[in-house]
Every structure is written in C-alpha cells, then in structure tokens.
C-alpha cells in the first residue's frame, strides 16, 4: 500500500529543537524567533512494524532529503545515525527494521523506541547543542520525551 506520511517537527520535553549538525548528525538546542527556521522537518511515515495497541511503527525521514534515522550497532553499542537511501525506493510501507521506531504516546508526550533495539530510545542530553542519540535508559538524566508539531506540506 502507498505509505502514509506527515510532515512535522519534534521538540524534546525541555523545548529544545532539533537541527542539522554536519551532513549526518542532528543536535538539540533551544531556538527562538527566526532561528526556528533552522529546525529539521521530518517526514514521518506510518510503516509496518510490531504494532501494538499503544505503539505505532513509524520511520523518520528528513523532509525532501534522502536521509532517514536508523539504528545500528557501532562498537557493539546501539547507535542512532542518519542514513542515506535511494529516493526512488523510499519511503515504503515495508521499511527495514533499522529504520523503524515505535511511537509511544504517554501523557501527551511521545517516545520513539527503536524497533531494532527494544528499550533504546531517541534521546537528547540536558546540555545544549549536543547530538541526538540512542539511549538505553528512560527517566534518567537524558531526555526521551518529545512533542510533535505538524507542518503543512
């Protein structure tokens, strides 16, 4: 089936926005005013995954770029990366597992759990201007809660 997608931005629970930091990395920092235009717009695609009544599988691509967030092992550690794909073949309903995140809504906040690495989440640091990463702890220092803002196509 044709994959259903929507455009959105994400902010962590401290209201930090996500921006590009070099060609293959995202970082989180507080933005205001015109600087808000720097934040990345995601194309969130609703894909096949191990869907449950409270987890919705999604893929997170960067709008109008052939880059997707993916989860891979690097030095034996689950790691978040931006991966380049062939735009002729993506997005698709049946994404490879490394591209899939379980979107979990709790108290109007969103978590994004890696399908490839259960209990690892898209995370930001408390500190400003630090990379967005895949974290294996919830409720600790690192931030795993996000809000989503819809962006018109």
């Amino acid at each position: 089936a044709p994959v259903r997608s929507l455009n959105c931005t994400l902010r962590d629970s401290q209201q930090k926005s996500l921006v590009m930091s070099g060609p293959y990395e995202l970082k989180a920092l507080h933005l205001q005013g015109q600087d808000m235009e720097q934040q990345v717009v995601f194309s969130m695609s609703f894909v096949q995954g191990e869907e449950s009544n409270d987890k919705i599988p999604v893929a997170l691509g960067l709008k109008e770029k052939n880059l997707y967030l993916s989860c891979v092992l690097k030095d034996d550690k689950p790691t978040l990366q931006l991966e380049s794909v062939d735009p002729k073949n993506y997005p698709k309903k049946k994404m490879e597992k490394r591209f899939v995140f379980n979107k979990i809504e709790i108290n109007n906040k969103l978590e994004f759990e890696s399908a490839q690495f259960p209990n690892w989440y898209i995370s930001t640091s408390q500190a400003e201007n630090m990379p967005v990463f895949l974290g294996g702890t919830k409720g600790g220092q690192d931030i795993t809660d996000f809000t989503m803002q819809f962006v018109s196509s």
């Epitope: 089936a1 096949q48 191990e50 049946k94």
Partner: antibody, heavy 122, light 107 residues
C-alpha cells in the same frame, strides 16, 4: 518442524472466563509473533489479536476489553484469556504463527494449530 | 480497518473445471493478500502468501493475481481433493481481516 497445539477448550458458563494455551515447537517465541483466531460453528474466520516476539500485544477492537494475550517464552506457550463469555463466543479457537519477516511479510500467518473448541452454554 | 469482500460465497463445480474466487479490499493493500484452504474439522492451510507466492508443496494448479484492492484466486483444473472452503486474508495492516469464505462444492 513447526507445530502449534491448542488446549484448554471445553464447556464454559455464560459470564465465565476461559484460558487457552498454545504450546509451540520448531520456532522460538522470542523471535516470532503468534495470533489467535476463532471460528464459530459453520461461520468464517475472525482474527482476535496477537503477541509479538518482544511481548507487545495488539487486540482487535471489538474484543479488546475482554481479551488478554500473554506468553511464557521458557515454556514455549502462548495464552489467551477471555472474560465475560457469552453464547456467541462459542467457537473453535486457533493459534497461528506470524511470518514476522521484516521488510517483506510481517503480518502474514503461515502455520496453524488444530484448534480447541469452546462451548459457552448453561 | 481494511474490509475484505469475498465472492462468491459458494460455488458448485466439477472435476477439471477452472474456478475463480475474488477478494476486494476497502483500502490499497499492495500485494499483501494471502489465500487459505480449509477442510471440515481442520485448520486453514496457507496456499499462497503475499506477493502471489505459491507456498512450497502446493500444486501449481493454484495461483493468484492482483494488487491494490482487487485480487483473484484461481484453480486451473479442479481435483477431487480441492473441494473445500477458501479464505483470503489481508496482511497489509492490523487488525488482520479475512474474507467471508467461499465454499467450493461438487456439482
């Protein structure tokens, strides 16, 4: 060889509950999802829900409030608990293995058990 | 939820006949249609999985075609053991949904 064997069926009073078991062999429950499906006498197939390898569950909306699917990986067994039974829940209950092939066929079901008959009657 | 409409609900045919069953879905499911055969007192048996893929060990007289919303299942030359009930199942999205079934009887 993949096998699924259901048990626990029988006669249940209206308003009662049932707990069915599905013992599996030939595959690992931590790697594959398992669905439950039922078939009322002389009727078609109705998908009830599933439990994934990681333990997450998805229930079909009309029955969501009355169903619980769980599993014990160490016993290679999946369970279906159903409450507040009524006459229309009389059916053969099947468990089936999900294909769980990421990026290809995640939701299809390939192997089925023989089924266990549940009769709801006073 | 994706609704699946299967037709006909019953069908009388003779050995050697060519038989066709149709399933139409309420949403585009790409090629994610599966076809099962069920005999009385037995569980359904998967004949054709998504992508019109014949399962190992299933005779080549069984075939399917279609994508999107319109799907067809064909038995090219009916054999005595083919008289059974056939179901389609969409596996594109949850909840999984079956067609109502087609009972294939001897004419």
């Amino acid at each position: 060889e993949v096998q699924l064997v259901e048990s626990g069926g029988g006669l249940v009073q209206p308003g009662g509950s049932l707990r069915l078991s599905c013992a599996v062999s030939g595959f690992t429950l931590s790697d594959y999802g398992v669905s439950w499906i039922r078939q009322a006498p002389g009727k078609g197939l109705e998908w009830l829900g599933l439990i994934w390898g990681g333990g997450d569950t998805y229930y079909n909306s009309p029955l969501k409030s009355r169903l619980t699917i769980s599993k014990d990986n160490s016993k290679s067994t999946v369970y279906l608990q159903m409450n507040s039974l009524r006459a229309e829940d009389t059916a053969v209950y099947y468990c089936a293995k999900q294909r769980t092939l990421w990026g290809y066929d995640l939701y299809g079901m390939d192997y089925w058990g023989q089924g266990t008959l549940v009769t709801v009657s006073s | 939820d994706t609704q699946v409409t299967q037709s006909p609900s019953s069908l009388s045919a003779s050995v050697g006949d060519r038989v066709t069953i149709t399933c139409i879905t309420s949403t585009d499911i790409d090629v994610d249609m599966n076809w099962y055969q069920q005999k009385p007192g037995k569980p359904p048996k998967l004949l054709i999985s998504q992508g019109n893929t014949l399962r190992p060990g299933v005779p080549s007289r069984f075939s399917s075609s279609g994508s999107g919303t319109d799907f067809t299942f064909t038995i090219s030359s009916l054999q005595p053991e083919d008289f059974a009930t056939y179901y389609c199942l969409q596996s594109d999205n949850l909840p999984l949904t079956f067609g109502q079934g087609t009972k294939l009887e001897i004419k």
